[in-house]
Interface confidence: medium
């Protein structure tokens, strides 16, 4: 395995699956240094590519509730407030790390999992495919 | 804390910090159920609120490198390809979970951390404040 300049206070891992299984402190530290980050909660209505938020809940996952964005229109809202189909509303997707209880229903054993979520929508110029 | 119907096969945690400290399997499972998620790699250029990606590196964090979106313009790109300052490019932000080595330099002990990242930008109608 890797040799790291070792802190003498490091815990030992006697787990047979080490180093696949590690100890994680769930006392989550919030590194959002800006104490009042501008919350993007109203952007979903004000955007030219507006979106709705859908609740995705899974009690075996941490975080158990994830809000997913779904673009309201195929096109984008123009200056007149109408949908312009010459432009496209597309979801901005992001992979996030979550914890899944494994085995299921175990309160202190998890597996890291990667899931893809749509965070919001943006308006893009379409890619036009010209047929020869 | 939460009471979970306990699976008899659950590992025990003898850790004095239980249930704050849990075992996590790092063999990351990919739950992207859509077998071909559209990677949004070109949206940052095609958007009417385009963004650049900036590198943020921290060797004590996983993932160690996070590329953050920064909107290119205050305004949005109009149909003529010019910046329209009657509209605003704004970042869409999302909290993500990362793992931090804790204590520092320990290879098998981590703390979950929440950080706010800008995933991309969207074009919004500005909020106009009328001065009386």
């Amino acid at each position: 395995g890797i040799t790291i300049p070792r802190n003498p206070g490091c815990p030992n891992s006697e787990d047979k699956n080490f180093p696949r299984t590690v100890m994680v402190n769930l006392n989550i530290h919030n590194r959002n240094t800006n104490t009042n980050p501008k919350r993007s909660s109203d952007y979903y209505n004000r955007s030219t590519s507006p979106w709705n938020l859908h609740r995705n809940e899974d009690p075996e996952r941490y975080p158990s509730v994830i809000w997913e964005a779904k673009c309201r229109h195929l096109g984008c809202i123009n200056a007149d407030g109408n949908v312009d189909y010459h432009m496209n509303s597309v979801p901005i997707q992001q992979e996030i790390l979550v914890l899944r209880r494994e085995p299921p229903h175990c309160p202190n054993s998890f597996r890291l999992e990667k899931i893809l979520v749509s965070v919001g929508c943006t308006c893009v110029t379409p890619i036009v495919h010209h047929v020869a | 804390g939460i009471t979970i119907p306990r699976n008899p096969g659950c590992p025990n945690s003898e850790d004095k910090n239980f249930p704050r400290t849990v075992m996590v399997n790092l063999n990351i499972h990919n739950r992207n159920t859509n077998t071909n998620p559209k990677r949004s790699s070109d949206y940052y250029n095609r958007s009417t609120s385009p963004w650049n990606l900036h590198r943020n590196e921290d060797p004590e964090r996983y993932p160690s490198v996070i590329w953050e979106a920064k909107c290119r313009h205050l305004g949005c790109i109009n149909a003529d390809g010019n910046v329209d300052y009657h509209m605003n490019s704004v970042p869409i932000q999302q909290e993500i979970l990362v793992l931090r080595r804790e204590p520092p330099h320990c290879p098998n002990s981590f703390r979950l951390e929440k950080i706010l990242v800008s995933v991309g930008c969207t074009c919004v109608t500005p909020i106009v404040h009328h001065v009386a």
């Epitope: 395995g1 890797i2 | 071909n36 990606l53 060797p59 004590e60 490198v65 590329w67």
Partner: antibody, heavy 126, light 107 residues
Framework: EVQLVQSGAEVKKPGESVKVSCKAS????????ISWVRQAPGQGLEWMGG????????DYAQKFQGRVTITADESTTTAYMELSGLTSDDTAVYYC???????????????????WGQGTTVTVSS | EIVLTQSPDFQSVTPKEKVTITCRAS??????LHWYQQKPDQSPKLLIK???ESISGVPSRFSGSGSGTDFTLTINGLEAEDAGTYYC?????????FGQGTKVDIK
């Protein structure tokens, strides 16, 4: 600029072991993984195994399990690959390659090999 | 293990011509496929990652497409310096595997 510099060519006898090093510079060592890929003369590329530096996780291809040991030393930013029980079939160029642990444009981009070492020729001959 | 099959094995092409190399995976690998170029006596070099994402410093004539099991590397307007062997590589499942390679030479 990221660079991976490997140790020099080796000539070994059958049954011996070889240990190849890969010194990394540029970028945070814990921020990526190192894989080892070999190429026999006139042949294609074959993945042997790799280490995720941040977690110290090592994965090996089944074919090499028990014969190969991959380690890394964060203090010297060097990864090592040791292959034992050498036979003439192990004559090859051995490459180390970097796997980024990056969160790029919304995705965990962790599995492409974005930088490669210059290669180490290992010749096994009696 | 995932088997990657490239075609053709060999291609002889005149400069400025379009080159298409395909890579077929034995099962679905989403977009976890990468393309490398290897010139004689050199290390491989990453050309395209995740099926279609371009790499900084790689000429724009190189592009990739596909998902699931079928992938394509395209060189639009081959140049003399593009001679070499091209490999696909999947990272969806361990062990990582490579295609057998496609050798491209210039007529």
């Amino acid at each position: 600029e990221v660079q991976l510099v490997q140790s020099g060519a080796e000539v070994k006898k059958p049954g011996e072991s070889v240990k190849v090093s890969c010194k990394a510079s540029g970028g945070s060592f814990s921020g990526y993984g190192i894989s080892w890929v070999r190429q026999a003369p006139g042949q294609g590329l074959e993945w042997m195994g790799g280490i995720t530096n941040f977690f110290g996780i090592v994965d090996y291809a089944q074919k090499f399990q028990g014969r190969v040991t991959i380690t890394a030393d964060e203090s010297t930013t060097t990864a090592y690959m040791e292959l034992s029980g050498l036979t003439s079939d192990d004559t090859a160029v051995y490459y180390c390659a970097r796997e980024p642990n990056e969160f790029w444009n919304g995705y965990y981009a962790t599995h492409d090999f974005d930088y490669w070492g210059q290669g180490t020729t290992v010749t096994v001959s009696s | 293990e995932i088997v990657l099959t490239q075609s053709p094995d060999f291609q002889s092409v005149t400069p400025k011509e379009k080159v298409t190399i395909t890579c077929r995976a034995s099962q679905n690998i989403d977009s976890e496929l990468h393309w490398y170029q290897q010139k004689p006596d050199q290390s491989p070099k990453l050309l395209i990652k995740y099926a279609s994402e371009s790499i900084s410093g790689v000429p724009s004539r190189f592009s990739g497409s596909g998902s699931g099991t079928d992938f394509t590397l395209t060189i639009n307007g081959l140049e003399a310096e593009d001679a070499g062997t091209y490999y696909c590589h999947q990272s969806a499942f361990l062990p990582y595997t490579f295609g057998q390679g496609t050798k491209v030479d210039i007529k």
